[in-house]
């Protein structure tokens, strides 16, 4: 009874197509598969950024796999062949591992890379990224931003830089068609006569860095002798009402401060007959139904209601 063995896949490699972190892992079938012609061979692929505690594991019949990585760090991957138990009249047979690594050969000391990179997708419409130059770099240093997301043929360079003292310190992006709910890759590299500049890589999803406009049209409605309904409208733009959370700050007679978070464009407030003035502001954020994260908008303009009797509805802006 001879032991069944299978070879690992051949020519296992990580290929960088120039998409700033979206890499291809590819391989060829193992040698000597002739004995298993009736069998569908599978491959178990494990990969991770170097330094990560956990491996991502994929089982596939294909000869390739694609995923996103952090190119600031190296990438390691390993793969072996799996023969299902149906092929071996018993238990599953695994080959030894084939291993490979990939990293971008760096240049420049780490301090030269951009500092404090910050990207905001304003009102789910306009992406703006800004950064500070690296430490100790001279004014002749210029940084260039490149970006890619699935749907673009190749990485694009920023065409509208924000400048300070002649240096690029930010980028205003053009309209980004069909760019949300997928990884968005950025590389900021640089050049200088004086010294090499370290590149930096960033990955995020646009819906998670949205900063909406503040709510508008704040109003009061007396519901009863002891209740007032605060209302507002969603800001103009592409974000649907179902995607908003709101935070309200209410000040009663310059003393009591109420803060509340709500999901709708209304809030009912209990008041007393003694209340002489009521002011509130509201801000918005994309909620967990539409993103994993977000940035609070600026506060709206303050809306106040004052007078001896709130029921007189003296509305002050």
């Amino acid at each position: 009874d001879t032991e069944i063995k299978v070879n690992p896949p051949q020519d296992f490699e990580i290929v960088d197509p120039g998409y700033l972190g979206y890499l291809y892992l590819q391989w060829q079938p193992p040698l000597s598969l002739d004995h298993f012609k009736e069998c569908t061979v599978e491959y178990e692929l494990k990969y991770r950024n170097i330094g990560s505690e956990t491996w991502k594991t994929i089982i596939t019949k294909n000869l390739h796999y694609k995923d996103g990585f952090d190119l600031n760090k190296g990438i390691e991957a390993k793969i072996h062949t799996l023969l299902p138990w149906q092929c071996t009249n018993g238990s599953e047979v695994q080959s030894s591992w084939a291993e490979t690594t990939y990293w971008i050969s760096p240049q420049g000391i780490p301090e030269t890379k951009v500092q404090d990179m910050d990207c905001v997708y304003y009102n789910w419409q306009y992406l703006l990224c800004s950064w500070k130059p690296g430490i100790g770099v001279l004014l002749d240093t210029n940084y260039n931003l490149f970006y890619w997301y699935e749907g673009l043929d190749h990485a694009l360079q920023c065409v509208d830089y924000i400048k300070a003292d002649g240096q690029n310190i930010g980028c205003r992006f053009p309209y980004l068609e069909a760019s949300d709910y997928k990884d968005f890759y950025i590389c900021v590299n640089g050049s200088s006569e004086n010294k090499p500049i370290r590149s930096s890589y960033f990955t995020f999803q646009l819906q998670n860095i949205v900063k909406p406009l503040p709510p508008v049209y704040l109003t009061f409605t007396r519901e009863s002798s002891c209740e007032i309904k605060l209302k507002w409208s969603i800001p103009l733009g592409p974000i649907p009402a179902r995607c908003f959370d709101y935070e309200i700050e209410i000040r009663e007679d310059d003393t009591t401060l109420v803060t509340a978070t709500v999901e709708n464009e209304t809030y009912t407030l209990k008041t007393t007959n003694e209340t002489r003035q009521l002011c509130f502001v509201v801000r918005s954020k994309v909620n967990i139904y539409c993103s994993d994260d977000g940035i609070w908008s600026e506060w709206s303009d303050k809306q106040c209601w004052e007078g001896e009797d709130l029921s007189k509805k003296t509305l002050l802006r």
Epitope: S105, P106, E111
Partner: antibody
Framework: EVQLVESGGGLVQPGGSLRLSCAAS????????VHWVRQAPGKGLEWVGV???????DYNSALMSRFTISKDNAKNSLYLQMNSLRAEDTAVYYC??????????WGQGTLVTVSS | DIQMTQSPSSLSASVGDRVTITCTAS???????LHWYQQKPGSSPKLLIY???NLASGVPSRFSGSGSGTSFTLTISSLQPEDFATYYC?????????FGGGTKVEIK
């Protein structure tokens, strides 16, 4: 197996020049940067500079005007050209491979003595 | 330049002792870029710990590293005869790259 072998050290007079070599094997200089680090007798380690895989160079600015790092990818070798040598340049000179922002393999070193 | 100050500059210890060496940077250093090297007499330095706390290949688990910001530590939990050497901390964050003055660990 990764190996770095330095050569070219020796006795040189103050004001003279010397060119050190670092022969790399087991890896390619097109994939890895290589540093020069020196150590004066009985003293600590001092970074001289690095030649990056892509061909650019970073120097210790205190030495930059007198020292030049170059490489020959075809020979997989790194060089350190030292001019206007002074007594304080007397040291063992090491080349060391850069890997993920650390120096993971070092050569055995070559001694440079600057004396009249 | 970032000055790296090691203390003590030398120490005497016995086999089995726990040894701690500290390294203080004059400016904050990212933990990613703080490394430790071991150098034995007549030999070249050898990478011991990289990125503050990760053991280089083949380094025994009795060595450990910790710290952040400007203060970093190398610990040998139980000193072995082959550990008598000089240890250097090293920052790779800012140019020029700099090393500590070294800590010589001698046999008591």
């Amino acid at each position: 197996e990764v190996q770095l072998v330095e050569s070219g050290g020796g006795l040189v007079q103050p004001g003279g020049s010397l060119r050190l070599s670092c022969a790399a094997s087991g890896f390619s200089l097109t994939k890895y940067g290589v540093h020069w680090v020196r150590q004066a007798p009985g003293k600590g380690l001092e970074w001289v500079g690095v030649k990056w895989a892509g061909g650019s160079t970073d120097y210790n600015s205190a030495l930059m005007s007198r020292f030049t790092i170059s490489k020959d990818n075809a020979k997989n070798s790194l060089y350190l050209q030292m001019n206007s040598l002074r007594a304080e340049d007397t040291a063992v000179y090491y080349c060391a491979r850069d890997h993920r922002d650390a120096m993971d393999y070092w050569g055995q070193g070559t001694l440079v003595t600057v004396s009249s | 330049d970032i000055q790296m100050t090691q203390s003590p500059s030398s120490l005497s210890a016995s086999v089995g002792d726990r040894v701690t060496i500290t390294c203080t940077a004059s400016l904050s250093v990212s933990s990613t870029y703080l490394h430790w090297y071991q150098q034995k007499p007549g030999s070249s330095p050898k990478l011991l710990i990289y990125s503050t706390s990760n053991l280089a290949s083949g380094v025994p688990s009795r060595f450990s590293g910790s710290g952040s910001g400007t203060s970093f530590t190398l610990t040998i939990s139980s000193l072995q005869p082959e550990d008598f050497a000089t240890y250097y901390c090293h920052q790779y964050h800012r140019s020029p790259l700099t090393f500590g003055g070294g800590t010589k660990v001698e046999i008591k």
